[in-house]
Interface confidence: medium
């Protein structure tokens, strides 16, 4: 009997998607590349449930972790790597006083119980996301 695995080895399944939490650190742009190399995308968050799940993963491991969000194109206008804008309800995920753009902080990370903006050239952990494989048929 063949078992269906919706996600690759060492990836985590959640609500129809697969997530890879890195064990090494890269800058934000290299994190994008790392995800593309495995057929995924630096994580774009689409729902409150997904945010809660990812925040928990990040805070449990006590790691600062890149997500696919930046205001590199236009200061103060936060945009996901898939081109979609940051929804108004998602602004509540920023930590107190963030984003503060201290010293050109243009990329978003999971930090503690919320989000922080930090310098994109800093090496951090990252999370990739891709659709889970279908197990029907």
């Amino acid at each position: 009997e063949r078992l269906c695995h919706p996600c690759p080895w060492e990836w985590t399944f959640f609500q129809g998607n697969c997530y890879f939490m890195s064990n090494s650190q890269r800058n934000w742009h290299d994190s994008i590349t790392a995800c593309q190399e495995v057929g995924a995308q630096l994580v774009v968050i689409k729902s409150a449930e997904e945010q809660n799940f990812l925040q928990l993963q990040s805070s449990r491991s006590n790691r600062f972790t890149w997500m696919g969000l930046s205001d590199l194109n236009h200061e103060g206008t936060w945009q996901w790597v898939d081109g979609s804008p940051l929804l108004p309800s998602f602004k509540q995920y920023w930590n107190k006083g963030e984003p503060n753009n201290v010293g050109e902080e243009d990329c978003a990370e999971f930090s503690g119980n919320g989000w922080n903006d930090d310098k994109c050239n800093l090496a951090k952990f990252w999370i990739c996301k891709k659709s889970a494989a279908s197990c029907s048929g």
Epitope: S89, G97, E98, P99, W115
Partner: antibody, heavy 122, light 106 residues
Framework: QVTLRESGPALVKPTQTLTLTCTFS??????????VSWIRQPPGKALEWLAL???????YYSTSLKTRLTISKDTSKNQVVLTMTNMDPVDTATYYC??????????????WGRGTLVTVSS | DIQLTQSPSTLSASVGDRVTITCRAS??????LAWYQQKPGKAPKLLIY???SLESGVPSRFTGSGSGTEFTLTISSLQPDDFATYYC????????FGQGTKVEIK
């Protein structure tokens, strides 16, 4: 001490434009994460959210009323202004302004003004 | 728009009673829900945020629970000061309030 206070006319005529001012102290609307909202409550009825303005000047409006509403801020005066056009007797309500705090726990309203009653009548 | 439905609309209770108010959302709002208390002629007062977090200064007899679409506010032992109207409010997508639950003296 954080306070918010609403001011504006107690009586407006139908078809007129209502202008309400929220004057606040104890916080700054230039602080990241801070927002100010307007919420109304017709006599004996439920609360209804109208509009919100963020620290970064993003503005959000109630779907059903957005064509009639404009929200703006004057950070230097610590004021938020709401204008509502084409007033009707059904707009008679107590109008509140409220603050949304900074932080990653969400955009709820932690502090409210006392409210100002606006009656629409000819 | 997300709709919130509170039940019951009115609740008659006595001092010392355990009181539960329910708030149902028309779609999932995760835990982005707040509860407010309002007394006649006064502004609403925040009790609970993020579904279960107690606002500073609010008595511990108030507890919130739930996630997704179903939420409850419980008052463990009703006090004379608790007779009021209670509103739930979601902030997952824009902002909407429930229609309110009036807690009155039996």
């Amino acid at each position: 001490q954080v306070t918010l206070r609403e001011s504006g006319p107690a009586l407006v005529k139908p078809t007129q434009t209502l202008t309400l001012t929220c004057t606040f102290s104890g916080f700054s609307l230039s602080t990241s994460g801070i927002s100010v909202s307007w919420i109304r409550q017709p006599p004996g009825k439920a609360l209804e959210w109208l509009a919100l303005i963020d620290w970064d000047d993003d503005k959000y409006y109630s779907t059903s009323l957005k064509t009639r509403l404009t929200i703006s801020k004057d950070t230097s005066k610590n004021q938020v202004v709401l204008t509502m056009t084409n007033m009707d007797p059904v707009d008679t309500a107590t109008y509140y302004c409220a603050r949304t705090p900074s932080g990653s726990y969400g955009r709820y309203f932690d502090l409210w003004g006392r409210g100002t009653l606006v009656t629409v009548s000819s | 728009d997300i709709q919130l439905t509170q039940s019951p609309s009115t609740l008659s209770a006595s001092v010392g009673d355990r009181v539960t108010i329910t708030c149902r959302a028309s779609q999932s709002i995760s835990n982005w829900l707040a509860w407010y208390q309002q007394k006649p002629g006064k502004a609403p007062k925040l009790l609970i945020y993020k579904a279960s977090s107690l606002e500073s200064g609010v008595p511990s007899r108030f507890t919130g629970s739930g996630s997704g679409t179903e939420f409850t506010l419980t008052i463990s032992s009703l006090q004379p000061d608790d007779f009021a109207t209670y509103y739930c409010q979601q902030y997952n997508s824009y902002w909407t309030f429930g229609q309110g639950t009036k807690v009155e003296i039996k």
